[in-house]
């Protein structure tokens, strides 16, 4: 608990929450979800749990798209009450609100073994790539809410229905989007600050789903009903989710690293990258997949497999040192991430409290960059960039909340692998 | 809602030591630093040092490094200071104080253990 | 150690009158800096952290300001109840350090 402060707020995925203020969460590919309830505690956590449902007692209850619960007929509100929800309207057909579907030829990496899972939500259509499990069976079926078919007796497959389990899956290479960012795995050499790494360790991406399900990539596609189409753009055959950068790939010069192209919407716009004029060293290099020259030193040996300019830049962003400190007690894990940022001059800790694998507490401290210096438990693990910092405290919000109600082994750790900058193939960032 | 209650009043003779306590409750112990600070007869507040209950860390002010111990029970949520080798100039009020978002914004205080040196 | 100078030491106001307390620090600390109030025989009461955010509860009438080494504490209009003793705090960089505290009386 903590002392409320006048300005206190939640902010959670981009929108800002009055203290005591609730709703349901917007979770890709399902819109919202009315199976989780979120509220913005008055310390400016944001604290979500899902509705427990109640047994109902008819032979055949009704499911209502926006109540969360079944109900039996009897008890359902007057039409004139009901939330009258944005239908959605797809390829000329119609969906209502909380509608699953599936399309095709939206991606165009998929592969055999993946489907495209759309649904319907207050009128946008959001829609997923989808890694389907392996059949073990001869004669799958088909089910309602999901676009892979299944075996028979494999278990309720509606999100509402499941144990709440968090959707994790192995990292999908071809797929490279925003936090529900397909691929968190850092290079194996990238071996920093004693942080180790966990080679069988599942990625999180928040979306939730059923956990026999557990085995695909989510990639968020917005498809709304002005434009029809998705959020995204495509560059040398390579698919980029809206705010993404890349170097582009010329088929005479191959990849142009002084060159960094972002998604907007669906159009890329690529501007030149300005190197300094002025180096902090006598003798900078000129690396190979880099565009500026940079100072050989130290920071280079702490941190390998990372590509960062001079003043610790990576691909034209400013980056900041992250530190890691763990504790474990008693049954109790103690894991501490800190940010230390220049404007303002703070530290930045994230604080965890794990017991059992049930998450107890979560907090933020920011501290002076003085009193962090003496703390000797961290180690330096990384640099990361501003625009990572925010995926990672967004995915923070969403597991913080999922991990105090179920058992999470690795869910932070993974998690904190966002911060991770990697060095992509052939050095383009 | 949080709450740290601090042991009762210590009458201790010279060069005796006295183990104060504060238990903590209505939010997760180890998540937080705890404060020490003193007030002595009519002067102002000073501060001794705080503790990391999670890991045990502690940090003093260099005037208290011979003076305090700072310890803490993770199974009660209790945080102790043992002071020793007490002289009369040791006689005041003992504080424990936590924070909720910013390392030394105390914002929580305990009610503060009055310690009497005499002979 | 940094040094905290708060001034005055004491002071005489009356109900309704507009207060300032300063703190001044031996060094930059960042806006660092809370405020507390204490009454005789009291815990002391957090009233401002990091130089001018107001702790949830404590009347709208006490602000904050400052930045680098000098910091204020204004009570705009000063009521009964804010007759006590007043400190400021420096947690930029342990040692911690307090001001020597401001005592303000009615006139």
């Known amino acids: 608990e903590q002392v409320k402060h006048s300005e206190t707020y939640c902010m959670f995925q981009d929108k800002k929450y009055r203290v005591g203020e609730r709703w349901h969460p917007y979770l890709e590919p399902y819109g919202l979800v009315y199976c989780v309830n979120c509220i913005c505690s008055e310390n400016g956590n944001v604290l979500c749990s899902r509705v427990r449902c109640p047994n109902v007692h008819c032979l055949s209850p009704v499911h209502i798209p926006h109540l969360c619960c079944p109900r039996c007929p009897d008890s359902l509100p007057p039409v004139n009450n009901k939330v009258t929800s944005k239908s959605c309207e797809y390829n000329g057909t119609t969906y209502q609100h909380g509608e699953l579907f599936v399309a095709e030829g939206l991606f165009q990496n998929r592969q055999p073994n993946q489907c495209t899972q759309c649904s319907c939500s207050e009128g946008n259509v959001y829609c997923g790539l989808k890694t389907c499990p392996k059949l073990t069976c001869a004669f799958p079926v088909s089910v309602p809410d999901s676009c892979c078919r299944v075996c028979r007796g494999d278990g309720e497959l509606s999100w509402e229905h499941s144990d709440g389990d968090i959707f994790r899956q192995p990292a999908n290479r071809e797929a490279r989007h925003s936090y529900h960012r397909s691929h968190y795995d850092p290079p194996p050499s990238r071996q920093a600050g004693g942080l180790s790494r966990f080679p069988g360790a599942r990625s999180h991406r928040g979306a939730l789903m059923d956990s026999q399900q557990a085995s695909g990539t989510i990639v968020q596609i917005v498809i709304n009903n002005k434009h029809k189409h998705g959020q995204v753009c495509v560059s040398n055959g390579k698919t980029y989710s809206h705010g993404e950068s890349w170097h582009p790939n010329l088929r005479a010069f191959g990849i142009v690293e002084c060159v960094l192209c972002t998604c907007n919407v669906t159009k890329q716009e690529c501007k030149k990258i300005h190197c300094p004029n002025r180096y902090p060293c006598k003798y900078p290099q000129k690396i190979d997949g880099k565009c500026c020259k940079v100072c050989p030193g130290k920071k280079a040996k702490e941190l390998p497999g990372q590509s960062f300019d001079n003043k610790g830049y990576f691909c034209g962003e400013e980056t900041m040192p992250v530190y890691e400190s763990v504790f474990m007690e008693d049954g109790e894990t103690t894991r501490k991430i800190a940010l230390e940022t220049e404007r303002p001059p703070q530290v930045e800790v994230h604080v965890w409290t794990i017991r059992k694998g049930i998450l107890q507490h979560f907090h933020i401290e920011k501290i002076s960059k003085r009193m962090f210096e003496e703390l000797p438990h961290f180690k330096l693990v990384t640099r990361t960039t501003l625009s990572q910092w925010k995926i990672f405290t967004e995915g923070e919000a969403q597991i913080s909340q999922m991990c105090s109600s179920r058992v999470c082994r690795t869910e932070l750790e993974d998690l904190v692998k966002v911060l991770y900058l990697e060095r992509s193939e052939k050095g383009h960032c | 809602q949080v709450q740290l209650q601090q042991s009762g009043a210590e009458v201790a003779k010279p060069g005796a030591s006295v183990k104060l306590s504060c238990k903590a409750s209505?939010?997760?112990?180890?998540?937080?630093?705890m404060h020490w600070v003193n007030q002595r007869p009519g002067q102002g507040l000073e501060w001794i040092g705080y503790?990391?209950?999670?890991?045990?860390?502690?940090k003093y002010n260099q005037k208290f490094k011979d003076k305090a111990t700072l310890t803490v029970d993770k199974s009660s949520s209790t945080a102790y200071m043992q002071l020793s080798s007490l002289t009369y100039e040791d006689s005041a009020v003992y504080y424990c104080?936590?924070?909720?978002?910013?390392?030394?914004?105390?914002?929580?205080w305990g009610q503060g253990t009055s310690v009497t040196v005499s002979s | 150690d940094i040094k905290m100078t708060q001034s005055p030491s004491s002071m005489y106001a009356s109900l309704g009158e507009r207060v300032t307390i300063t703190c001044k620090a031996s060094q930059d600390i960042n806006s660092y800096l809370s405020w507390f109030q204490q009454k005789p025989g009291k815990s002391p009461k957090t009233l401002i952290y990091?130089?001018?955010r107001l702790v949830d509860g404590v009347p709208s009438r006490f602000s904050g300001s400052g930045s680098g080494q000098d910091y204020s504490l204004t009570i705009s209009s000063l009521e009964y109840e804010d007759m006590g003793i007043y400190y400021c705090l420096q947690y930029d960089e342990s040692p911690l350090t307090f001001g020597a505290g401001t005592k303000l009386e009615l006139k």
């Open positions: 990091r130089a001018n």
């Open positions: 209505g939010y997760t112990f180890t998540s937080y630093w």
């Open positions: 503790i990391d209950p999670s890991s045990g860390y502690t």
């Open positions: 104080a936590t924070y909720s978002n910013y390392v030394g914004a105390m914002d929580y």
